[in-house]
């Protein structure tokens, strides 16, 4: 039978004895096969980290900062339940640390040295630690003690709770700097009015702190948040402009057989139980003997964090890079306003070969990152492990929903100014063999499908989007007989087709041959029925332009395309026979690197990019013999987005509007996790 | 397509030094990048050290200071000059000139270089 008790670790007497309490109440209401609670007592959160890491105990609830020291080694536990405040249809898992100024004053986050800056309270969160953390590197040399370093950096502060002795200036604007609210500018209400009142030039407080002390917008609209990108904007738009976004309040367990499902069933039970209104015998969110034991008094509920999330993503890039900052005290040496090198993210062997040569042929400005999805490759540039790659446009809404933004877009299409002019988009078409000549658009239930993967554009989103309006469910492996969509689940019909050996079956990368563009044709021309690709796939492939064997003898004349009032048309003919048209792939890349990658894959081109005649002598960015790896081959130049910035802008709002609709039947474990940080 | 064939490796003391040679069978003048990989039990292969036509090299943070690459285009030779060698060195080195493409994995036998007291 399995162990079905969740060990609960409490830290304080009071702790243990509201844990008991839990522990009696669930027994009282829960069948004896469901989940029950056993109480852990020890000295400190750190402790309860230890322990659980031990398999001494298996759950804890932690602050943000904690929830970092629990996932670093040897700890390594992830998050698997958030606290929710406000309601049930608005919760709340996160708040947003901001910087405020006023309207008028005309500076920005890179331009902070000088001013005077109101905190809420020395180490505290976003008053401090945050705001401190991302900016350490400015900080004068030498950076400890950290005070003093604050103290040269700011011409004056309100850092409440700091030593008014030894760092006079820390309490400049708020003399005695008194670590309670007898001292006005202490808080977050405190460090508000220290920027109100005209003391400060900056405050570092929540997203909420401006709202529940101007309750008129009028009033509001004086002031401006300082986003991390150098620019400012309205007050209310705090999640695109703010400097992290941090978790309230989360219930940590082990990575590795963490009992994530059944903490979830266990909380869930509770919340049902004895959550807020419930009970009066038992309140899960009540602390008669202290305040905040267990879970927070103020938590309204729980929500499952998706299993995909690890600490790093929970936390986020922004969070993790400032508490990283103050904890190791580490900075690049390099100036800051020099360009790292980019380190590319590459999918599986085949494309890091290929990374690997342009890395030494770039002389220091690429390096490569390995990665086996494309899932993969946007969490690790979410969380810096890499900086970016060039996405299909579903990738790309993924990545945009994780924080991610479109810098250069690939242009197909010779012209004379092809870097300042981004393409309208290319065609999605469906191909069948000719000879197969009874097959349409509108008959294609039962038949072998072969797709570029799921979450592409023309291998998967438009297709699949257009079906689903036909058919209405999500079953699309029920819909065709058998097929190859890499990414399926391994025992689903939609990985049957597919030609991967081994734990390479159905991979979405280019381990598995029927992968991508050139794979789903290959898929077509060896097992299936039709191809969902782009428009320009047929003729790279026939015509003896692929020389692999299953290629070199392939004709064009021989496929043709489905259109979608039923009939079917030559393969030339696309522009009056596709699916729909497809926003052009493009390279995505965290905020804060936006600049630097525009910069450097613009001096890359032009060292390698299609002005190189001869590429058997040189090394050449936009080919890989038909393969697609990191750029597509037909890849002509990169081009500037102008004002098509934002994933929105850059995909468009039908094709977003598209892909929200499938969004019912995703399976992307990464989309789960974004929206559950971002809805 | 040239067929590239190592040697140079062999047994060899922590601290010690190797110089892996890899023959290419025609010319590498107008190869634009030769790099030399290794593979350890278990790992995946990973770059070692690159150089372009130019001569432009690059490699990995774990052999800076100690390794050099060096091609002789007469001798249609690349070289590896591995000095301060450590136990993690020990794996399995093979050079390649990119030719054959990123996607068939052409890679020759490759030489054994262990590095043990």
């Known amino acids: 039978v399995p162990d079905k008790t969740v060990r609960w670790c409490a830290v304080s007497e009071h702790e243990a004895t509201k844990c008991q309490s839990f522990r009696d109440h669930m027994k009282s209401v829960i069948p004896s096969d469901g989940p029950s609670v056993a109480c852990v007592k020890k000295a400190s959160y750190l402790d309860c980290i230890r322990a659980i890491a031990a398999n001494e105990a298996d759950a804890v609830t932690l602050d943000a900062g904690l929830v970092y020291d629990a996932y670093l080694a040897p700890n390594n536990l992830k998050p698997v339940v958030a606290e929710f405040y406000g309601s049930k249809e608005d919760p709340q898992t996160f708040y947003y640390a901001v910087a405020v100024v006023k309207k008028d004053s005309g500076f920005q986050m890179n331009q902070l040295r000088g001013k005077k800056s109101c905190h809420t309270g020395l180490g505290r969160s976003a008053g401090w630690n945050i705001p401190i953390g991302l900016l350490y590197c400015d900080l004068p040399e030498p950076r400890k003690p950290l005070e003093k370093a604050v103290a040269n950096f700011f011409s004056g502060s309100c850092a409440p709770c700091a030593d008014g002795t030894d760092f006079p200036q820390l309490c400049q604007l708020c003399p005695g700097c008194g670590c309670s609210t007898l001292n006005q500018y202490f808080g977050y209400s405190g460090a508000f009015k220290c920027l109100k009142d005209g003391a400060g030039d900056v405050a570092f407080v929540k997203h909420s702190t401006i709202f529940e002390n101007l309750a008129n917008k009028a009033d509001r609209d004086q002031y401006e948040l300082l986003c991390l990108d150098n620019t400012r904007k309205p007050v209310d738009e705090y999640k695109d402009c703010h400097l992290a976004q941090v978790p309230s309040h989360t219930v940590v367990a082990r990575s590795m057989g963490g009992k994530e499902d059944l903490i979830w069933e266990l909380l869930n039970q509770a919340q049902e139980h004895f959550g807020k209104d419930k009970s009066k015998e038992f309140q899960l969110f009540s602390s008669p003997h202290g305040k905040d034991l267990l879970f927070k008094d103020s938590a309204h509920g729980f929500l499952k964090v998706p299993p995909r999330m690890d600490a790093k993503m929970y936390l986020g890039y922004e969070y993790v890079t400032a508490i990283r900052n103050l904890r190791e005290g580490t900075c690049p040496e390099a100036p800051t306003d020099e360009c790292k090198p980019v380190k590319w993210c590459a999918l599986s062997h085949h494309e890091r070969l290929k990374c690997d040569e342009w890395s030494v042929n770039s002389v220091g400005k690429i390096e490569c990152v390995s990665a086996e999805t494309t899932e993969d490759c946007i969490a690790k540039i979410m969380n810096g492990e890499a900086d970016a790659m060039s996405l299909d446009g579903g990738f790309v809404y993924i990545a945009g929903k994780c924080g991610l933004v479109p810098v250069l877009a690939e242009n197909y299409n010779k012209s004379d100014n092809c870097e300042d002019t981004p393409e309208a988009g290319y065609f999605a078409i469906a191909v069948v063999k000719k000879s197969a000549s009874d097959l349409t658009w509108d008959n294609l239930k039962g038949k072998k499908s072969c797709h570029t993967a799921v979450g592409r554009t023309a291998g998967w989103n438009i297709p699949m989007g257009l079906l689903y309006n036909k058919i209405n469910h999500c079953r699309f492996d029920e819909f065709f007989s058998e097929g190859c969509a890499p990414g399926s689940k391994k025992d689903s019909s939609l990985c049957k087709l597919c030609m991967g050996s081994g734990l390479n079956l159905c991979e979405p990368n280019n381990k598995e041959g029927y992968y991508g563009y050139t794979g789903a044709f290959r898929c077509l021309v060896e097992k299936g029925d039709v191809a969902f690709v782009k428009h320009q796939t047929v003729p790279q492939n026939t015509g003896g332009k692929n020389p692999d064997p299953w290629a070199k003898n392939l004709n064009e004349k021989d496929y043709e395309l489905l259109c979608l009032d039923g009939t079917r048309k030559p393969v030339e003919e696309y522009a009056n026979c596709h699916l729909a048209r497809a926003p052009n792939h493009a390279v995505v890349t965290r905020k804060d690197k936006e600049a630097c990658v525009h910069k450097i894959l613009r001096q890359q081109q032009h060292l390698f990019g299609s002005n190189v005649t001869d590429c058997s002598g040189n090394f050449c960015l936009f080919r890989s013999e038909t393969k697609d790896l990191l750029f597509r081959d037909d890849t002509v130049c990169l081009a500037k987005l102008h004002d098509r910035n934002t994933y929105e802008k850059y995909l468009g709002e039908e094709y977003v509007k598209a892909v929200g609709n499938l969004r019912k039947c995703s399976t992307s474990s990464l989309l789960e996790a974004c929206t559950f940080r971002r809805p | 397509h040239v067929q590239l064939v190592e040697s140079g490796g062999g047994l060899v003391q922590p601290g010690g030094s190797l110089r892996l040679s890899c023959v290419a069978s025609?010319?590498?003048?107008?190869?634009?990048?030769m790099a030399w990989y290794r593979q350890a039990p278990g790992q995946q292969r990973e770059l070692v050290a690159g150089i372009t036509r130019g001569g432009s090299t690059k490699y990995a943070d774990s052999v800076k200071g100690r390794f050099t690459i060096s091609r002789d285009n007469a001798k249609n030779t690349l070289y590896l000059q591995m000095n301060s060698l450590k136990p993690e060195d020990t794996a399995v080195y093979y050079c390649?000139?990119?030719?054959?493409?990123?996607?068939?994995?052409?890679w020759g036998q490759g030489i054994q270089v262990t590095v043990s007291s």
């Open positions: 025609g010319s590498i003048a107008s190869v634009a990048t």
């Open positions: 390649t000139d990119y030719s054959r493409g990123y996607y068939q994995d052409y």
